[in-house]
């Protein structure tokens, strides 16, 4: 069986370094990985709770 | 719109194999996570495993290498392979996708697989 | 693995009650400011449905009488009036660190 990306991760692991351009910041495996290899954000509804901290070119829903 | 449906379900004696697979439309299975979760009769959610982007798999360690997630990009399907089934991996195995967050708001119908002699 | 541990694991209401649900989790499921932790909702018979995601982001058609709170290792499911169609079960769920878990579960019985 394959280990998980984040089998080592904690909790406390260093917040992720800005993605380069044309990447998006993958929260499930902690790393920048192309955009188009993740879902296509879907835009927030009006009055919807506001957004995680961008610490990344992280993909809001 | 993405739907999920499953198929490959059925009766199977202990040890036996079986396949399950997921045909997804309105999406590529190239793009963010596709699951298997089941659900034993009368049970909780149990998180089988996933597939990734990139074709990385990762499972519920308590399955103990029995399951292998594979895809089939040509045919926009992913496929659960079951070896050495028990009585007690009887359950109804559902397919689904997630968020970037992990949440799953995406299911197939579910398909039920009964391990029994 | 994180252990998710839901209470109770049922409870009877009645049609407008305010109903809460707990979740614990064995350690905190936080990364990057954000809570990975989610709520389902299931009938017999049928596959789980996304009710609120990053632990109070409500999904897209859910009726507002839904609402998650809670952050690190303590979260809560909320339905301000329960309706008759409420009636089911619920889950937890993290996606903090692999393998996923799901909580146990809560039974939303009819009193």
């Known amino acids: 069986m394959r280990r998980g990306p984040r089998s080592l991760r904690g909790r406390d692991a260093p917040a992720p370094t800005p993605c380069v351009p044309a990447e998006c910041f993958d929260l499930l495996v902690r790393h920048c990985v192309a955009c188009g290899l993740l879902r296509t954000p879907r835009p927030k509804p009006a009055g919807a709770s506001s957004p995680a901290p961008r610490t990344a070119l992280q993909p809001q829903e | 719109e993405v739907q999920l449906v499953e198929s490959g379900g059925g009766l199977v004696q202990p040890g036996g194999s079986l396949r399950l697979s997921c045909a997804a439309s309105?999406?590529?299975?190239?793009?963010?996570?596709w699951n298997w979760v089941r659900q034993a009769p009368g049970k909780g959610l149990e998180w089988v495993g996933y597939i990734n982007y990139s074709g990385t798999t990762y499972y519920n360690p308590s399955l103990k290498s029995r399951f292998t997630i594979s895809r089939d990009t040509s045919k926009n399907t992913f496929y659960l392979q079951m070896n050495s089934l028990r009585a007690e991996d009887t359950a109804v195995y559902y397919c689904?996708?997630?968020?970037?967050?992990?949440?799953?708001?995406?299911w197939g119908q579910g398909t039920l697989v009964t391990v029994s002699s | 693995d994180i252990q998710m541990t839901q209470s109770p694991s049922s409870l009877s209401a009645s049609v407008g009650d305010r109903v809460t649900i707990t979740c614990r989790a064995s350690?905190?499921?936080?990364?990057?400011?954000?809570?990975?932790m989610h709520w389902y909702q299931q009938k017999p018979g049928k596959a789980p449905k996304l009710l609120i995601y990053?632990?109070?982001d409500l999904e897209s058609g859910v009726p507002s009488r839904f609402s998650g709170s809670g952050s690190g290792t303590d979260f809560t499911l909320t339905i301000s009036s329960l309706q008759p169609e409420d009636f089911a079960t619920y889950y937890c769920q993290q996606t903090s660190k692999d393998p996923w878990t799901f909580g146990q579960g809560t039974k939303v019985e009819i009193k």
């Open positions: 990053r632990a109070s």
């Open positions: 350690e905190s499921v936080d990364d990057y400011g954000i809570s990975f």
């Open positions: 689904a996708r997630p968020h970037n967050y992990g949440a799953m708001d995406y």
């Open positions: 309105g999406d590529s299975i190239t793009r963010g996570y």
